[in-house]
């Protein structure tokens, strides 16, 4: 018997006392448990168990699947087993066909043998065709055959057990291996917009993509910085082998302002985790949000063109634009179109493109855009610089040389003196009176400068001349003065033009 | 050659003590339990004690003639079985038989020749 | 300790005859039982183990039967290399006991 020192419990012993035993089908199956504190015998075989109070264990007629391991159990929890093979020449193999290998790790092939004395116990592919050349497996009469780390292209590979007995090779039930792969990346997780603007009272729904190698992903919706429990639905879907798509809908069906927030769509695996999030606002009613991109005061010389653009935000949608110019709508030369075409894009650009303006164009350009909502609008005032022009240009009956001028900015007038027949006057002569004549008239538009000087004061023949200029150009206009006796007369009044 | 063959037999008083050996070739002696079986002149065969191999935990009985007696131990290292016999009796004169069982039952498919035990003033 | 009686102690038999020898356990042993054949001055030998089970390289003239407590050996046609002692062995539960043995004898 076992040496165990005096009083501690010993384990129980087995008659017949062998590790292993082979006993003939139909033959009696007898073992005595012998144990003063005997308890039971339990027997297992692949997922079956059975259990005997007698201390002699008995089957009349051994059949194959009485097979298995025979546990004698003592009142101290100590046991002792035999391992009792039935053989039977008509079933070599007791097979469970159930065959899950989670990808490497090692898995059993259920297939014990109820005549350990064959020979060549192995795996076979089916049909004839060859097993994978790096599939290596170690065979156990008792257990089965392990394959050692299981790919994950041995996916529904097709075995045999297979045996020698008696010089002819027996083979088990088929065997289709199903590879559980192994998680070597963070699941890819996406969402279907990554914000989201409301109104009180629409629904929000939100899917989230999660898509892995196999469906013992786990998923879930999350509230930033709140632990609620979060109503989703899911379906799923395998393409293919180990290419799993899961989706998940978050739904609030009727969105309230406080439901305003990030939401977290977390997945994880063995390997790691991943997640994306969707930004929700929801706002008591929509808006619309005007950003000019130049100043709205706008400088333009004459004849040139000039781009007014807008940016604006509008939830909903922007349902009427238009550009008015003097209660006028223009019906073309603008356009609006959205600032992005991503689906969640509330921002708009509209752009109304003024060309060669005149002088007359200056004024109040109005952008109006509304929705189903509110109405907003933006202005832009217009001011053409134009070059003086010389309107007037006189010698009064009261001895005054006058000069009217117009343009915008508002042009300066400087008088100077040539004698004799030169064309380069230098000598400047100081107006008597200087007026702007439409200060007070219609903001846009050109500015009338009048500007007058003292004829008397011109003792010799000459010209005089009224130079008329602004930030656009200058224009001048010259009187010729002759003396008869004492009279002096304007004689050929003309205009240059100097750019 | 698959064989036992056993050594260490002789005369002995009562009393005394004796060693016997087996040593074992042509397999694989760990993996078997073994056994001493003993004759006595003109009679038949008795069964004297066995050991198990390692995956029974080297476990030991005994024939209740030689136990407490009679001790049965291995060496795997060196493919040997033996017997320790003290406190000898004339009743234990007989051939002592060193003998193999197979891997899944008990009986005996393979014996030494014997070794000749003789206890006698 | 379960007793083995094995009978008859000897038997006179020519060489082609049909021999049958019995054994008797004191309680049921199940299948656990083997028989052996012993020469003179030789080792004994193996010849059924299991009750029925032949050993390899046993002849097949010899078998063997019975289950529980009682078992026959059956040598179907006597040989000259059959004139031996033939013992019945338990190998249920320790001490392993055999038979007294049956001697089988030309005529």
């Known amino acids: 018997q076992p040496s165990v020192s005096p009083g501690e419990p010993s384990p129980p012993s087995i008659h017949p006392a062998k590790s292993e035993l082979i006993v003939r089908v139909g033959n009696e199956i007898r073992l005595l448990c012998i144990d003063p504190g005997f308890v039971k015998w339990t027997f297992e075989i692949l997922d079956e168990t059975n259990e005997n109070k007698q201390n002699e264990w008995i089957t009349e007629k051994a059949e194959a699947t009485n097979t298995g391991k025979y546990t004698c159990t003592n009142k101290h929890g100590l046991s002792s087993s035999i391992y009792v093979f039935v053989r039977d020449p008509a079933k070599l193999f007791l097979v469970d066909r159930s065959l899950y290998g989670k990808e490497d790790n090692d898995t059993l092939v259920r297939c014990p043998l109820t005549d350990p004395e064959v020979t060549s116990y192995s795996l076979k592919g089916c049909q004839g065709k060859p097993l994978p050349k790096d599939l290596r497996f170690v065979p156990d009469p008792k257990a089965g055959i392990t394959i050692k780390s299981v790919k994950r292209a041995y996916h529904r590979l097709c075995l045999h057990c297979s045996a020698d007995q008696e010089g002819k090779s027996v083979l088990s039930d088929k065997f289709i291996l199903k590879v559980r792969p192994a998680f070597k990346a963070v699941p890819v997780v996406s969402v279907s917009k990554a914000s989201y603007l409301l109104r009180e009272g629409e629904e929000f729904t939100v899917t989230c993509t999660i898509k892995d190698v196999s469906s013992s992903v786990y998923s879930t919706w999350k509230r930033e910085n709140s632990q609620t429990k979060l109503q989703e639905k899911y379906n799923s879907w395998h393409h293919g082998d180990f290419n799993y798509e899961r989706q998940a809908t978050l739904t609030i069906s009727s969105a309230r302002v406080n439901d305003s927030g990030v939401f977290m769509c977390y997945a994880n695996n063995t390997f790691g985790s991943a997640n994306v999030t969707t930004t929700l606002e929801v706002v008591d009613k929509g808006f619309i949000n005007i950003f000019p991109m130049i100043n709205t005061t706008v400088f333009v010389n004459d004849g040139e063109n000039v781009d007014l653009i807008v940016e604006y935000e509008a939830f909903p949608k922007p349902e009427h634009q238009q550009w008015i110019y003097m209660n006028r709508t223009f019906t073309d030369k603008w356009e609006d179109y959205p600032k992005s075409e991503n689906e969640s894009n509330i921002r708009y650009v509209s752009e109304l493109h003024l060309t060669r303006l005149k002088g007359t164009e200056g004024g109040t350009y109005t952008f109006l855009v509304s929705n189903s909502d509110v109405n907003a609008s933006i202005a832009f005032n217009v001011y053409v610089n134009t070059k003086p022009e010389i309107l007037t240009y006189d010698r009064l009956v009261n001895g005054m040389l006058q000069c009217v001028a117009a343009g915008f900015p508002e042009p300066t007038i400087d008088w100077y003196f040539c004698p004799g027949t030169e064309q380069r006057c230098s000598a400047s002569v100081l107006p008597v009176d200087v007026q702007t004549l439409n200060a007070s008239g219609p903001p846009f538009g050109k500015l009338v400068v009048q500007s007058s000087i003292d004829s008397s004061a011109f003792k010799h023949n000459g010209t005089v001349e009224c130079k008329a200029y602004n930030d656009v150009g200058k224009t001048s206009a010259y009187f010729n003065f002759a003396f008869k006796g004492n009279n002096k007369e304007q004689i050929h009044p003309h205009t240059l033009f100097t750019p | 050659e698959v064989q036992l063959v056993e050594s260490g037999g002789g005369l002995v008083q009562p009393g005394g003590s004796l060693r016997l050996s087996c040593a074992a070739s042509?397999?694989?002696?760990?993996?078997?339990?073994m056994d001493w079986v003993r004759q006595a002149p003109g009679k038949g065969l008795e069964w004297v004690g066995r050991?198990?191999?390692?995956?029974?935990?080297?476990?030991?009985e005994y024939a209740a003639s030689v136990k407490g007696r009679f001790t049965i131990s291995r060496d795997d290292s060196k493919n040997s079985l033996y017997l320790q016999m003290n406190s000898l009796k004339t009743e234990d004169t007989a051939v002592y038989y060193c003998?193999?069982?197979?891997?899944?039952?008990?009986?005996?498919?393979?014996w030494g020749r014997g070794t000749l035990v003789t206890v006698s003033s | 300790d379960i007793q083995m009686t094995q009978s008859p102690s000897s038997l006179s038999a020519s060489v082609g005859d049909r021999v049958t020898i019995t054994c008797r356990a004191s309680q049921s042993i199940s299948s656990y039982l083997n028989w052996y054949q012993q020469k003179p001055g030789k080792a004994p030998k193996l010849l059924i183990y299991a009750a029925s089970s032949l050993q390899s390289g046993v002849p097949s003239r010899f078998s063997g039967s019975g289950s529980g407590t009682d078992f026959t050996l059956t040598i179907s046609s006597l040989q000259p290399e059959d004139f031996a002692t033939y013992y019945c062995q338990q190998s249920y539960i320790a001490p392993y006991t055999f038979g007294g043995g049956t001697k089988v004898e030309i005529k």
């Open positions: 042509g397999f694989t002696f760990s993996d078997a339990d």
């Open positions: 003998a193999r069982e197979p891997k899944y039952w008990i009986d005996f498919d393979l």
């Open positions: 050991t198990r191999n390692k995956a029974g935990s080297y476990t030991t």
